[in-house]
């Protein structure tokens, strides 16, 4: 049934009315307003922006808009004792120092409170030693170094290029390899698109540009001092030694001009293959240490950042549902930025603002959604998804009982090529149907649907005539809702044609050059891609909040479960002898998937036929749909990751940004051939198969007829 059958609706107040009210010019205006000064988490400027958004959401017509504050652990550079890296000679004299700040972009020379580049939550320290180049510092890069090249990183300072995986995973890997410091840099191979000028003449990263970012390994914990519970006024806080996810070695980011000065002197082993070479005119030697003439020189880090418990503010707006006010559809995105936030997050926040305005306009004309819509402007996302996680921890009992869906709204663009969607399989059909009704903004697709341009430019690898939809990973505010609480979640943005560079971000990501002008001049001058993203995000929220029957299709979960079972089985079958020796069978998992498929099919048939005028039956069927995602939650969580509780999906243990399917089994199988106790290792594989099979079967049973 279409949305306009919801209660208290007139033909004027349907999805079309909501979408037609969204205006590109407003998004542009909001983006400008949100990007004129920095809005770093924990600062007065970001508090003032929170109050501004609260006030404007009230004006737009929401029923209530409240600030929710928490006191969480944040990290800042020392204003009088800057962080930098030196090359020192044999006498300990500093003969080269990296820059203390990024050259400011034109027009921003006099802006105060631009935080210099730093790695948030780095401990203090001044380690010195020989340098080892570790490529992207991925798990496989350290395997190559340690196992194939016999290079020991213990006691060394490692230099790694940004990209491919979340920076926190790089730091964790370096720690495990025994490094005593980490230098992160942006190589032009990953952050400079050929044929495009650097900012301010284009959207590429200049040599003095640096990517900021946190280097935590929180695994979904939220505030490092209050894992599992809100950082409120009466919170019990752990000591810093017991804090979750903090790095133990100093870390600092630099740009490629400074990196060149370090890398051009590298000696030792040659790079193992061309995949270890970037685009700088340096040998990309691995080390350890510098070559011939420079062999007595060392690298020294000077890190003086401090961790401080600081107040943060979420803005929570409510539009009460007319029929099911106790069912929540949430649209949330963060407000805090590293500097100006031209893309991250304000291109998303501007879209949320316009969506709120459009919903508010309808509400002022007498309309209400069927279900309650919650709008959130999260704080401290950049410091580890802290605002969203603390709020969800505080409201977990409500959310687990009432949460229908969460739609994330960080950066609206990371390119201007095509749509990118990551979501639960429950939302596949919603996304397909919605994009078929929206106009494509792409050149060459005038008069065609968004679905058509998206499918053409980003085809599904499995199903012809359908677009690619990816798994949810993490690195954004949906994490607590999906991975911890099991609330159906999705995200959408416009992306680049750069599939190989999926997790590196756009060139100016987290740099001072992420300005309003970057978006207005180079990415989306007409704000047509922003408008399309607003229509997708807003359209999903509208349907989720207004459809009489929730727009979830459980059959799509059945399809992916079979695909994921096949995939994990094929990984295990790389060890046929051990599977035989240790009697490892996937029969229980495949059986559970088969049962899920059959039960989901029958449920879908009943969903077509039931009496929708019976509010009790309607509510019952909707609850089965709502609680299906919840059924994949294991209350015990994944091994050593208690806040990642979803059995089907978790952030990859090797890359927080990427989603892994059947993560418990995957991690148990990972590098199993190197385990010292194979019997124990294969025993854990069997246990994880058991957990997965049980969970899939249990989830299937939630879709069975209730009596």
């Amino acid at each position: 049934k279409s949305s306009n059958e919801a209660t208290n609706i007139t033909p004027k107040h349907n999805m079309k009315a909501f979408l037609d009210e969204l205006k590109a010019e407003n998004i542009k205006k909001f983006l400008y307003n949100f990007t004129q000064i920095p809005h770093l988490a924990g600062t007065e400027q970001n508090f003032q922006l929170a109050k501004q958004i609260q006030s404007q959401w009230k004006e737009f017509g929401l029923d209530s808009v409240e600030l929710a504050h928490y006191d969480v652990l944040l990290s800042y550079p020392n204003k009088t004792h800057p962080n930098y890296i030196s090359i020192i000679n044999e006498d300990g004299n500093e003969i080269f120092n990296t820059s203390l700040f990024e050259p400011p972009p034109p027009g921003y020379e006099n802006v105060s409170d631009i935080v210099p580049p730093f790695s948030a939550f780095s401990p203090q320290g001044m380690p010195e030693g020989d340098l080892v180049y570790v490529n992207y510092a991925r798990t496989e890069d350290f395997f190559k170094l340690e196992r194939d090249m016999k290079i020991n990183c213990s006691g060394k300072i490692v230099i790694a290029r940004y990209g491919k995986v979340f920076r926190g995973n790089k730091v964790k890997n370096a720690q495990l390899a025994g490094a005593k410091g980490v230098i992160l840099y942006s190589d032009p191979a990953d952050y400079f698109a050929p044929g495009v000028k650097s900012y301010p003449d284009g959207w590429n990263l200049p040599g003095g540009g640096v990517q900021r970012g946190n280097i935590l390994n929180l695994n979904g914990a939220g505030d490092p001092l209050t894992p599992g519970y809100p950082a409120n006024e009466y919170a019990y806080r752990r000591g810093i030694a017991e804090a979750v996810g903090l790095p133990s070695i100093p870390v600092h980011p630099i740009g490629y001009y400074d990196a060149q000065k370090l890398l051009e002197k590298m000696g030792g082993s040659a790079p193992p293959d061309s995949s270890w070479r970037g685009s700088l005119k340096v040998p990309y030697n691995v080390g350890p240490g510098f070559t011939g003439n420079f062999s007595t020189q060392k690298v020294k880090m000077h890190i003086h950042s401090t961790n401080e418990v600081t107040r943060i503010y979420n803005v929570i707006g409510t539009l009460r549902g007319a029929v099911e006010p106790d069912r929540y559809v949430i649209l949330g995105g963060h407000r805090d930025s590293w500097v100006f936030g031209g893309i991250d997050p304000q291109s998303g926040a501007a879209v949320v603002h316009e969506i709120v305005r459009s919903f508010g306009t309808l509400k002022k004309e007498g309309w209400r959604p069927r279900r309650t819509i919650l709008f959130a402007s999260w704080d401290a996302e950049e410091f580890g998804l802290l605002g969203s996680t603390e709020w969800a921890e505080e409201n977990s009992r409500l959310l687990q009982e009432r949460g229908v869906a969460y739609i994330n709204a960080d950066s609206s663009i990371e390119g201007n090529y095509t749509l990118r969607v990551d979501c639960t399989p429950l939302m596949y059909s919603l996304v397909h149907n919605l994009t078929k009704e929206l106009k494509s903004p792409d050149e060459g697709f005038e008069g065609k649907s968004l679905y058509e341009s998206w499918t053409k430019k980003s085809p599904s690898p499995e199903f012809s005539g359908m677009p690619r939809i990816s798994k949810l990973g993490s690195g954004n505010d949906f994490e607590v809702f999906f991975q911890r609480l099991g609330i159906a979640s999705g995200r959408a943005r416009y992306t680049k044609n750069w599939e190989t560079n999926k997790f590196s971000g756009y060139p100016l990501y987290h740099s001072v050059y992420e300005t309003y002008e970057l978006v207005e001049k180079f990415y989306d001058p007409m704000f047509k891609y922003h408008l399309t993203v607003a229509q997708v995000r807003g359209g999903m929220v509208f349907e989720l909040a207004n459809s009489i029957v929730l727009p979830f299709d459980c059959r799509d979960y059945a399809v992916v479960l079979r695909k994921y079972a096949d995939k994990i089985y094929s990984i295990s079958m790389k060890h046929p002898q051990e599977m035989k020796t240790y009697s490892v069978s996937f029969d229980s998992l495949f059986s559970a998937v088969k049962n899920f498929t059959e039960i989901a099919s029958k449920f879908s048939e009943r969903l077509q036929d039931f009496d929708k005028s019976n509010p009790i039956v309607l509510r019952m069927m909707n609850d089965q749909l709502m609680f299906l995602e919840r059924a994949f939650i294991d209350p015990l969580g994944l091994p050593d990751r208690p806040f990642y509780r979803h059995v089907i999906y978790a952030p990859s243990s090797h890359n927080k940004y990427a989603g892994e399917s059947f993560p418990g089994i995957y991690d148990a199988l990972f590098d199993i051939e190197s385990k010292v106790d194979p019997s124990k290792a294969w025993g854990e594989v069997k246990r994880q198969i058991y957990v997965a099979a049980f969970t899939v079967q249990a989830a299937a049973e939630t879709l069975s007829e209730v009596a």
Epitope: N97, P103, P188, G207, Y257, S274, R277, K281
Partner: antibody, heavy 120, light 111 residues
Framework: SVQLQQPGAALVRPGASVRLSCKAS????????MNWVMQRPGQGLEWIGM????????RLSQKFRDKATLTVDKSSSTVYMQLNSPTSDDSAVYYC?????????????WGQGTSVTVSS | DVVLTQAPLSLPVSLGDQASISCRSS???????????LHWYLQKPGQSPELLIY???NRFSGVPDRFSGSGSGTDFTLKIHRVEAEDLGVYFC????????FGGGTKLEIK
Amino acid sequence: SVQLQQPGAALVRPGASVRLSCKASGYSFTYYWMNWVMQRPGQGLEWIGMIHPSDSETRLSQKFRDKATLTVDKSSSTVYMQLNSPTSDDSAVYYCARDGNFPYYALDYWGQGTSVTVSS
Amino acid sequence: DVVLTQAPLSLPVSLGDQASISCRSSQSLEYSNGNTYLHWYLQKPGQSPELLIYTVSNRFSGVPDRFSGSGSGTDFTLKIHRVEAEDLGVYFCSQSTHVPTFGGGTKLEIK
């Protein structure tokens, strides 16, 4: 805009060392190598050497090891080249030129050149 | 040092003609990262040299698209499609893969 300012001419006596200057503006001075290039009258271009303002690291062509000394003054964004024991053979136009770093690794901006005449 | 040999030494052309200049290197100019640091400069009469083409085929900003570079390894070519009066001067190839060197120059003049 990037500018490299050099004095137009210098007259020097044989054997009396001369210091040529090159004042940079319009960019982040410490990020880029500064090169010196010689051009004898009616001849081609010859690379002398380069200096990095951040740490004064110097690389000189083998041919000019004893002839040229490169220094930098970060406070004034100026690079200097001293010509030691000049002879008439050193009469030439001397250009400073910025190495454009990535993605160019070429001499993207040049000074106007200083014409050095070695004569008694 | 790497020797760059340019041909011809002098190239008389009529305005509107295509001009082609060759630059041959005594050793490969491909760097270990896969890039080739061979560049072209133009020195107009009485002026400093100016960068035209970097890394074999990329036009520097403001350089008209009638200039194009090509080649690999040890053999490189600069082409000027439809020569204009302002293109006259001496063209130098140069490499920065190894210790920097310049070619001897090719003088483009009116026929």
